[in-house]
Amino acid sequence: VAQVSITKCSSDMNGYCLHGQCIYLVDMSQNYCRCEVGYTGVRCEHFFLTVHQPLSKEYV
């Protein structure tokens, strides 16, 4: 298993991740957003809501 060197993003990237934590993937030379639950997208800019369908009357 290849090890990935990670660190916190620089202050220069403050605000890069809209709803998540910014981590710097050193060996890949890129910033990566670890999104909060419910958010997706490169910069955690999209909110998605998992809708659970209520049971229909015949099952109640």
């Epitope: 660190t7 620089s10 202050s11 220069d12 990237m13 605000g15 890069y16 809209l18 710097y24 050193v26 030379s29 890129q30 910033n31 490169v42 910069r43 800019e45």
Partner: antibody
């Protein structure tokens, strides 16, 4: 393949303005920050400022504040740098640079010549 | 603004020599420094980022080290194709380039 293609060379008179474009392909500029850097003939590299195209917020180097405007059109995946009140010392190659999803990927540069 | 003081501004060395360039930041930049090589008429080429991480395809004779405010870029054995100007860049807080070091062959 990711690319940043800049507009062509410009010749401007002192006091005029110039607007340089930087069109991205292969990636979405909303996923990145776009920086602008310039280099006068025989001189070093100078960071001018940057835009976050997603939030539409900008940061400028103090010396350019009030004279430079960086914008982005996410519908065309293009960033722009406009410099006003041009003087001869603004003669330089202007580069757009992508940062964020990939560390510092540069455009080919645009030569702006300011001459009366 | 963070200032980056790069030295020397120019140097002349023989093929095979070890070449060292330094950059001093006006405050702690937490290892967020990159090194670029620029040849006449070309855009800068990224060699190293995050102090010491070599970019793919960059020869291993190039290396970087440092922490806090003091950083070093080294060419372990100078080659004719290394003739260029080298720049440091801090990207901890916005961005600032060093003044550049022109490397020539003796």
């Amino acid at each position: 393949q990711d690319q940043l293609v800049q507009s062509g060379a410009e010749v401007k008179k002192p006091g005029a303005s110039v607007k340089v474009s930087c069109k991205a392909s292969g990636f979405n500029i909303k996923d990145t920050y776009i920086q602008w850097v310039r280099q006068a003939p025989g001189q070093g590299l100078e960071w001018m400022g940057r835009i976050d195209p997603l939030r539409r917020n900008t940061k400028y180097r103090e010396k350019f504040e009030g004279r430079v405007t960086i914008t982005a059109d996410t519908s065309t995946n293009t960033a722009y740098m406009e410099l006003s009140s041009l003087r001869s010392e603004d003669t330089a190659v202007y580069y757009c640079v992508r940062s964020g999803t990939r560390f510092d990927f540069w455009g080919q540069g645009t030569l702006v010549t300011v001459s009366s | 603004d963070i200032q980056m003081t790069q030295s020397p501004s120019s140097l002349s060395a023989s093929v095979g020599d070890r070449v060292t360039i330094t950059c001093k930041a006006s405050q702690d930049i937490h290892k967020y420094i990159a090194w670029y090589q620029q040849k006449p008429g070309q855009a800068p080429r990224l060699l190293i980022q995050y102090t010491s991480t070599l970019q793919p395809g960059v020869p291993s004779r190039f290396s970087g080290s440092g922490s806090g405010t003091d950083y070093t870029f080294t060419i372990s054995s100078l080659q004719p194709e290394d003739i260029a100007t080298y720049y440091c860049l801090q990207y901890d807080n916005l961005r600032t380039f060093g003044g550049g070091t022109k490397v020539e062959i003796k």
